[in-house]
Every structure is written in structure tokens, then in C-alpha cells.
């Protein structure tokens, strides 16, 4: 069974999964489809980079674009280093500035919605 | 203004290789993924596959996984199809097309490649 | 793969009058958290490369008139001339962009009487 076939049979039981079975699902390539994507939970989709994100979806990254201003797409997009969000290809907007820290402090990020960073 | 520029016409011997170009200008070419698609005389259109110009990661269509090689020159900002062991089949003309998100946005002008010995 | 379906594959009409032709995929194009249905309508003039009209299904793509207007949501969709042209005669395609391999439907050509 190759990845595609492999997500097909799997997809009507991605909507409640944790990050670390999203990370793993990266390696199979399953291309995943955006609409599936942005059915995901936030929080599991916030902590996957932008290699991890590239892998799920495959060709369909290139969708990211055409969704950048819906959740959880935007909210993912501002997580990310801008640097890594230009390999895309799509001409991302939002991310992290070269040569900011990115603090994990969840209650912050929790409270405010958005990463707590430290400027150069 | 966006422009794809590709060659009117390639003809090539069967079983021969042929690699068609499609020279963008007039936008960013790494921020747009670049299409392939392909139109037989009086029918539809099959898409081939799409690429990343900043990355180079391309995808394809299974039916043409075995028949085309997507590349791209960031420096020149051109995009590239290989098609390889050509028969009378793959007699075409091929569309590179710009995305504009999904959907494409920009085409352009086609090859038409003929096969014939 | 998706397989779209656009009826009729051929309908001539007058200047003037109101056409509307049909596209079908065999899978729903919506995308349920945005909204979105993944479905673009391009037209190709005679020994022209495709252009695009309408994408998301009913967003009409900058520069494209307004008696362009494409419909529908999830497996239906419609693309309707209001008032159709001379320069409107040509070969009408629908593209799902749901998910690879994208797939466009056969074509509607249109002929003006």
C-alpha cells in the first residue's frame, strides 16, 4: 500500500491527532489534502515545521498560499521562521524574523496567541 | 507584466528525449510554483505536475511519473520539462502555467511536440 | 482520481443570450473549514493557450467581465455567461485543485449562431 492509499484508508480518524502521530504520518508520504489539513487540531498543528509540513502535504502545500489568511494555516505561518517559510516557494508573509529568539512560554503564548520573541 | 515564454514548436524522433523551456519575467520566480500540462490535438487537458522554484521539489501526475523530469534555473528564471522514450502518444503541445495559489493563473503560449520518424 | 464532468460538451448561442454549462466531480471540491471549493473555470480561444476565469468556484480572476459568473458548491458547480459575445466563442474547461492529480473536465465548446 503506498502513502496515498495509506492516507485515504486513515483520513476520517486524523481529526483529533496529536502532533507526534502528524510527525510520523510526515514520513509516509501521504500528500495530505489541504481540506483534511485545515481540519486538524491547532494545537497539533502549530508545533510541526516547515519541512514536516512541506512532507504531509506534499504537492499540496502550494495551497497554503491560496489559505494563508484561515485557521490553523495563518496561525502555523506565524510560528514559523520567515526563512524557512521562503523555501515554500510561496511567497509567505509572517514569519519570525532572521535572527529573533523564540521563547516557549506557554502560559504567554497561551494568554496572547502568539510566540514571545526576543529581537537581535 | 507576467510572461511565460516557451518555444512554438520541437520535432523529435521516437524513442529520442526532448527538453522544452518556459522563461518567466515579470514576477518574483521563486514566490510561484510553476504546472505542466499537456493538450492533445482537439482534446482535454492532463496535468502533469507542479514544481517548487525555490526548492526544486517537484510532483507528478503517476501517468507521467516514468515520462517527464521537471527542473528549474533559479538564475535564469526558467522552468523545465524533460520528456523521455517519446512515441506518437506524447505527440502534444505542453503548457507550463504559473500558479496563482492552486488554481493557474498564467499560461503560457505552448510547444507543440511532434513525434514522427 | 477525481473525475470532472462538464455537460453539454457542445451548445451554440446567439449574441446576446444567457448560457450556462455544467461541471460534476465525482468527490466534494469543498473545503469545509474555509469555505473554499477547489474548483477554477478557464477559457481557451481558438489556437489559444487557456486563461483563467473564475477560481474558488465563483471568484472571478482580476480583468475577467462581469458576464462571467461562476456557481455552485461541493460536487455541482456552474459557470454562466449572462450575455454572451462574439469573443465569447471558445472552449470552456473546469479544474479541481482538491487534490492530485489535479483533473480538468472535458471541455464545453461554445459556438455563437
Known amino acids: 500500500m503506498n502513502g496515498s492509499e495509506y492516507f485515504v484508508k486513515i483520513q476520517s480518524f486524523l481529526g483529533g491527532a496529536p502532533t507526534e502521530d502528524l510527525k510520523a504520518l510526515s514520513q509516509q508520504n501521504v500528500s495530505m489534502d489541504l481540506a483534511t489539513f485545515m481540519k486538524l487540531r491547532t494545537d497539533a498543528v502549530l508545533p510541526l515545521t516547515v519541512a514536516e509540513v512541506q512532507k504531509l502535504l506534499g504537492p499540496h502545500v502550494e495551497g497554503l498560499k491560496a489559505e494563508e489568511r484561515h485557521r490553523p494555516v495563518r496561525d502555523w505561518i506565524l510560528r514559523q521562521r520567515q526563512d524557512d517559510l521562503d523555501t515554500l516557494g510561496l511567497g509567505l508573509q509572517g514569519g519570525i524574523p532572521n535572527g529573533y529568539l523564540v521563547l516557549d512560554l506557554s502560559m504567554q503564548e497561551a494568554l496572547s496567541g502568539t510566540p514571545c520573541l526576543l529581537g537581535p | 507584466q507576467v510572461q511565460l515564454q516557451q518555444p512554438g514548436t520541437e520535432l523529435v524522433k521516437p524513442g529520442a528525449s526532448v527538453k522544452l523551456s518556459c522563461k518567466a519575467s515579470?514576477?518574483?520566480?521563486?514566490?510561484?510554483?510553476m504546472h505542466w500540462v499537456k493538450q492533445r490535438p482537439g482534446q482535454g487537458l492532463e496535468w502533469i505536475g507542479n514544481?517548487?522554484?525555490?526548492?526544486?521539489?517537484?510532483y507528478y501526475n503517476e501517468r507521467f511519473m516514468s515520462k517527464a523530469k521537471m527542473t528549474v534555473d533559479k538564475s535564469s528564471s526558467t522552468a523545465y520539462m524533460q520528456l523521455s522514450s517519446l512515441t506518437s502518444e506524447d505527440s502534444a503541445v505542453y503548457y507550463c502555467?504559473?500558479?496563482?495559489?492552486?488554481?493557474?493563473?498564467?499560461w503560457g503560449p505552448g510547444t507543440l511536440v511532434t513525434v514522427s520518424a | 482520481d477525481i473525475v470532472m464532468t462538464q455537460s453539454p460538451s457542445s451548445l451554440a448561442m446567439s449574441v446576446g443570450q444567457k448560457v450556462t454549462m455544467s461541471c460534476k466531480s465525482s468527490q466534494t471540491l469543498l473545503n469545509s473549514v474555509s469555505q473554499n471549493n477547489y474548483l477554477a473555470w478557464y477559457q481557451q480561444k481558438p489556437g489559444q493557450s487557456p486563461t483563467l476565469l473564475v477560481y474558488?468556484?465563483?471568484t472571478r480572476e482580476s480583468g475577467v467581465p462581469d458576464r462571467f459568473i461562476g456557481g455552485g458548491s461541493g460536487t455541482d458547480f456552474t459557470l454562466t455567461i449572462s450575455s454572451v459575445q462574439a469573443e465569447d466563442l471558445a472552449d470552456y474547461f473546469c479544474?479541481?485543485?482538491?487534490?492530485?492529480?489535479?483533473?480538468f473536465g472535458g471541455g464545453t465548446n461554445l459556438e455563437i449562431k
Open positions: 502555467a504559473r500558479s496563482g495559489g492552486l488554481w493557474l493563473a498564467f
Open positions: 514544481i517548487n522554484p525555490s526548492s526544486g521539489d517537484s
Open positions: 515579470g514576477y518574483t520566480f521563486t514566490n510561484y510554483w
Open positions: 474558488f468556484a465563483s
Open positions: 479544474q479541481q485543485h482538491y487534490r492530485t492529480p489535479y483533473t
